[in-house]
């Protein structure tokens, strides 16, 4: 009696179970009572990443430089090309089909985590005792200047955007 279901890595065709083609190969002809499934390797710049019965391999993804993309990992007959973004840009999504410039942290905020090709800059507010007076994708919050260590006193208090202003101590007249 002809099978109604086939084992893993097989498929049902003409009432019989044929072997699927392994990753990296495409189907040329189905098996018969007397012959095995015929598969052929994918050409260069093509791939198939699963056991399959596809008659055409998929083209590798094109990492379009117009969009700020470049190849992170070259594709093989079994894997697609992996794209990432050029320096100063990061992927808009996990599939990395387009790029956006890294965000800069505004004054009052510092960089908690520098952006990568796949993640944006993470900013954090400068806590008390720290400041940032620039818009930057790289600079962390900097500590206020310690006036005491310079034998000076605070003349103007610092904020999250400005450093303290130090000045000489008022000398009392004798």
């Amino acid at each position: 009696e002809p099978p109604t279901a086939c084992r893993e890595k097989q498929y049902l065709i003409n009432s019989q179970c044929c072997s699927l083609c392994q990753p990296g190969q495409k189907l040329v002809s189905d098996c018969t009572e007397f012959t095995e499934t015929e598969c052929l390797p994918c050409s260069e710049s093509e791939f198939l990443d699963t056991w399959n019965r596809e008659t055409r391999c998929h083209q590798h993804k094109y990492c379009d430089p117009n969009l700020g993309l470049r190849v992170q990992q070259k594709g093989t007959s079994e894997t697609d090309t992996i794209c990432t973004c050029e320096e100063g840009l990061h992927c808009m999504s996990e599939s990395c089909e387009s790029c956006v410039p890294h965000r800069s942290c505004l004054p009052g905020f510092g960089v908690k985590q520098i952006a990568t090709g796949v993640s944006d800059t993470i900013c954090e507010p400068c806590p008390v005792g720290f400041f940032s007076n620039v818009s930057s994708a790289f600079e962390k919050c900097r500590p206020w200047t310690s006036c005491e260590t310079k034998d000076l006193v605070v003349q103007q208090a610092g904020t999250n955007k400005t450093d303290v202003v130090c000045g000489p101590q008022d000398r009392q007249r004798a």
């Epitope: 710049s45 320096e87 790029c99």
Partner: antibody
Framework: QVQLVESGGGVVQPGRSLRLSCAAS????????MHWVRQAPGKGLEWVAV????????YHADSVWGRFTISRDNSRSTLYLQMNSLRAEDTAVYYC??????????????????????WGQGTTVTVSS | DIVMTQSPLSLPVTPGEPASISCRSS???????????LDWYLQKPGQSPQLLIY???NRASGVPDRFSGSGSGTDFTLKISRVEAEDVGVYYC?????????FGQGTKVEIK
């Protein structure tokens, strides 16, 4: 001066193969992505394929995918289009074109694009029995 | 694939007069960097195509300033402020945002 010169066209029977070449001069070939574009007699422009500057990344139009392969030899400053299983509908003038680009440096220039700024004179492929 | 549609397909012009060609894309060509990835090319009779405008509105090197490109998103226009006899040929728009690249059908500009 900057120049692209195609060659390799001719009359060929359906099902046969042909390899087109595009010789580049006057610029650093290995720095530029390259395209093939074709034009059937009396018709408009049709994009065929693209290859990255290092040759590691390429893409073909659906109409030619699986039959045509774009490649390059940077040591010879030459772009190729290997055309297999040719059909009557592949009859066209084939042009190679350079992807213009800006110099890297300031942010935003990395993917600044200047159009397909240099084209060859074209080579004619006729597929006929 | 992105479909590019040009109009008119034929444009008879008088030398010294302005001319305008429209190009519409089936999806926006405005990218996250603020640029519109649309080019204009001119193919003069018996010649190879030549780049006129890139990124929607930037004139290519050596292109006369009577040519200008405008528009954003899906609607673009190529204008010739005063047509000259040497401007005859077929004008094509091409989107450069997506692979495969796609061209408009072409607009044939000829002298009346």
């Amino acid at each position: 001066q900057v120049q692209l010169v195609e060659s390799g066209g001719g009359v060929v029977q359906p099902g046969r193969s042909l390899r087109l070449s595009c010789a580049a001069s006057g610029f650093t070939f290995s720095s530029y992505g390259m395209h093939w574009v074709r034009q059937a007699p009396g018709k408009g422009l049709e994009w065929v394929a693209v290859i990255s500057n290092d040759g590691d990344n390429k893409y073909h139009a659906d109409s030619v995918w699986g039959r045509f392969t774009i490649s390059r030899d940077n040591s010879r400053s030459t772009l190729y289009l290997q055309m297999n299983s040719l059909r009557a509908e592949d009859t066209a003038v084939y042009y190679c074109a350079r992807r213009g680009m800006g110099s890297s440096g300031s942010r935003g220039d990395y993917y600044y694009y200047y159009g397909l700024d240099v084209w060859g004179q074209g080579t004619t492929v006729t597929v006929s029995s | 694939d992105i479909v590019m549609t040009q109009s008119p397909l034929s444009l008879p012009v008088t030398p010294g007069e302005p001319a305008s060609i429209s190009c519409r894309s089936s999806q926006s060509l405005l990218y996250s960097n603020g640029y519109n990835f649309l080019d204009w090319y001119l193919q003069k009779p018996g010649q190879s195509p030549q780049l006129l405008i890139y990124l929607g509105s930037n004139r290519a090197s050596g292109v006369p300033d009577r040519f200008s490109g405008s528009g954003s998103g899906t609607d673009f226009t190529l204008k010739i402020s005063r047509v000259e006899a040497e401007d005859v040929g077929v004008y094509y728009c091409m989107q450069a945002l997506q692979t495969p690249r796609t061209f408009g059908q072409g607009t044939k500009v000829e002298i009346k």
